[in-house]
């Protein structure tokens, strides 16, 4: 689940089994010149950043929930 910082794909691998309980925020990066794939980077309660698999049903659910809670705030 390493997160790189250069101008390229930031997610070198993704974490399996992520749980929404400790996710503070989610940043969804659309494909662009720096990276051809969608990247989902979660910031955890302890500040650590973790890459999630955008194709995972649970990750889609987490993103949807986060976006909805942002709208209602």
């Amino acid at each position: 689940a390493s997160v790189a910082t250069e101008l390229r794909c930031q997610c070198l691998q993704t974490l399996q089994g992520i749980h929404p309980k400790n996710i503070q925020s989610v940043n969804v990066k659309s494909p662009g010149p720096h990276c051809a794939q969608t990247e989902v980077i979660a910031t955890l309660k302890n500040g650590r950043k973790a890459c999630l698999n955008p194709a995972s049903p649970i990750v889609k659910k987490i993103i949807e929930k986060m976006l909805n809670s942002d709208k209602s705030n």
């Epitope: 974490l15 749980h19 309980k21 400790n22 650590r48």
Partner: antibody, heavy 119, light 107 residues
């Protein structure tokens, strides 16, 4: 390596209180939830609650709310569980267990602390 | 609270054989189930989390499957060191809840 070292066995009187400890080493104590789990003699495992040492946030099982308090001391990397108004129902082995940050699986456990409530 | 019904409560199997333990949740737990091995006098040991992901160091003889409310845990090629009590745990919703446990004995 990650280690959770719990305090020794306790023999206590009914109606009294007990405070058991769980000293963590080998990881950033403040950054991970610490869980507490109860096992009565011959019975299964029962989740009590958890504390996040970084900010003191807690979650309790409804059954244990009011029975005790979870605290954490960041300076000594030690989590504590205090149990009050003890009865024979509280005689059990109590375990602390670290919860991983991303998937909340309890990956490291203490060896357990036996509490016996007897007059 | 989510109830976890684990069965059987005990089972006896032969060395080299296979055993399967099941846990049924009272509602959908989104694959958030872990399985623990517990031996007397020790702390429980995480074997599998998120239904099927093996903890590092756990042999591939152990496996888990399931979705929704129904989950199972299997051990094949049973070895003497597998003698223990096994518990499922749901961690989809607080409070986390354990199944009642399955005591595994060797015939």
């Amino acid at each position: 390596q990650v280690q959770l070292q719990q305090s020794g066995a306790e023999l206590v009187r009914p109606g009294s209180s007990v405070k058991i400890s769980c000293k963590a080493s080998g990881y950033a104590f403040s950054d991970y939830w610490m869980n507490w789990v109860k096992q009565r003699p011959g019975q299964g495992l029962e989740w009590i609650g958890q504390i996040y040492p970084g900010d003191g946030d807690t979650n309790y099982s409804g059954k244990f709310k009011g029975k005790g308090t979870l605290t954490a001391d960041k300076s000594s990397s030690t989590a504590y569980m205090q149990l009050n108004s003890l009865t024979s129902e509280d005689s059990a082995v109590y375990f602390c267990a670290r919860e991983r940050d991303y998937d909340v699986a309890m990956d490291y456990w203490g060896q357990g602390t036996s509490v016996t409530v007897s007059s | 609270d989510i109830q976890m019904t684990q069965s059987p409560s005990s089972l006896s199997a032969s060395l080299g054989g296979k055993v399967t333990i099941t846990c049924k949740a009272s509602q959908d737990i989104n694959k958030y189930i872990a399985w623990f091995q517990h031996k007397p006098g020790k702390g429980p040991r995480l074997v599998i989390h998120y239904t099927s992901i093996l903890q590092p160091g756990i042999p591939s003889r152990f496996s888990g499957v399931g979705s929704g409310r129904d989950y199972s845990f299997s051990i094949r090629n049973l070895e003497p060191e597998d003698i223990a009590t096994y518990y499922c745990l749901q961690y989809d919703n607080l409070p986390w809840t354990f199944g009642g446990g399955t005591k595994l004995e060797i015939k």
